[in-house]
Interface confidence: low
C-alpha cells in the first residue's frame, strides 16, 4: 500500500453567468503550451477580483477545468481552448478539477500513534543489523568451542 | 449513490473541542480512503487530514497534534477529533471520500454538504 496520502481530488460542477468583463478569470496550457509536465490540460492561472468567477467562490487559481458545457478540453491548442470560453455563451457550465495539497504533510503514519511516525525502515534496519552481529558473535564463540 | 452526511459543527470557544462525524452510505467503505478538508469565506480549500483504510493517516501541519482522525469500518462512519480550537480554524468542514491510497479522487456527489465550524 502508498503510505503517502498528501493530496485530495476533487470534481465539481460550476455555472458561472457570463459578466461585463467575461467570465473573470485567465487559463494556461493546451498542447501547445504545456503548464503541467506531461499534462496538456487546461489551468486556472488567475482570477480577476470582482469578476463572475471570484463572486462565485469556487473556481480557484491552479484548478484544473475539463469541460466547457459538456464540451472536453482535451488535446487542444491553447488558442482553440481560449476561443471555447469565448464562444461558450451566457450561461457557461465548467467541470473543474481540484487539486488540494496536505500543506508540508509528512510521510503517513499508522493509527493513533506519535504524529512524527517512524519510518519502518529506521526501525528494521538497527533489528537486522542487531541480528547479524548476534549471528556472527555466535558462530565465533561455537567455532572456538 | 454514495452519500455523505457530516455532523458536529458549532460555535465554540477558542481552547475548546468538537467531534466532527461523517457517516457514509454505500457498501465500498471499507476499501476507501477518507478525509477533512474545510474552506474559510475567502481563502483557498485545504486539506486538513486523510485516512486510509489501512488506518493510515496525515496531518496538515495548521492541526497536527490537535486534531484526530479515526474511522470505524463496521458503522461507515468518519470522526474528526478537534481540540485546542483556534479561531483560524472557523471555516464549513467537508468530508470526503475515494477509493486509492495515494489521493482522494472524490466526485461531487461523494463529497458532503459541509458543517459549520466556528471559533470565537
Known amino acids: 500500500m502508498n503510505g503517502r496520502v498528501d493530496y485530495l481530488v476533487t470534481e465539481e460542477e460550476i455555472n458561472l453567468t457570463r459578466g461585463p468583463s467575461g467570465l473573470g478569470f485567465n487559463i494556461v496550457g493546451g498542447t501547445d503550451q504545456q503548464y503541467v509536465s506531461n499534462d496538456s490540460g487546461i489551468y486556472v492561472s488567475r482570477i480577476k477580483e470582482n469578476g463572475a468567477a471570484a463572486l462565485d467562490g469556487r473556481l480557484q487559481e491552479g484548478d484544473k477545468i475539463l469541460s466547457v458545457n459538456g464540451q472536453d478540453l482535451k488535446n487542444l491548442l491553447h488558442q482553440d481552448a481560449v476561443d471555447l470560453f469565448r464562444n461558450a455563451g451566457y450561461a457557461v457550465s465548467l467541470r473543474v478539477q481540484h487539486r488540494l495539497q496536505v500543506q508540508n504533510g509528512p510521510i503517513g503514519h499508522r493509527g493513533e500513534g506519535d504524529p512524527s511516525g517512524i519510518p519502518i525502515f529506521m526501525v528494521l534496519v538497527p533489528v537486522f543489523a542487531l541480528t547479524m552481529v548476534a549471528a556472527w558473535a555466535f558462530m565465533r564463540y561455537r567455532q572456538q568451542l | 449513490e454514495v452519500q455523505l452526511v457530516e455532523s458536529g459543527g458549532g460555535l465554540v470557544q477558542a481552547g475548546g473541542s468538537l467531534r466532527l462525524s461523517c457517516a457514509a452510505s454505500g457498501s465500498i467503505f471499507r476499501i476507501d480512503v477518507m478525509g477533512w478538508y474545510r474552506q474559510a469565506p475567502g481563502k483557498q480549500r485545504e486539506l486538513v487530514t486523510a485516512i486510509t483504510s489501512g488506518g493510515i493517516t496525515n496531518y496538515a501541519d495548521s492541526v497536527k497534534g490537535r486534531f484526530t482522525i479515526s474511522r470505524d469500518n463496521a458503522e461507515n462512519t468518519m470522526y474528526l477529533q478537534m481540540n485546542s480550537l483556534k479561531p483560524e480554524d472557523t471555516a464549513v468542514y467537508y468530508c470526503?471520500?475515494?477509493?486509492?491510497?495515494?489521493?482522494?479522487?472524490?466526485?461531487?456527489?461523494?463529497r458532503g454538504q459541509g458543517t459549520q465550524v466556528t471559533v470565537s
Open positions: 470526503a471520500k475515494g477509493i486509492s491510497d495515494s489521493y482522494l479522487r472524490v466526485e461531487s456527489n461523494y
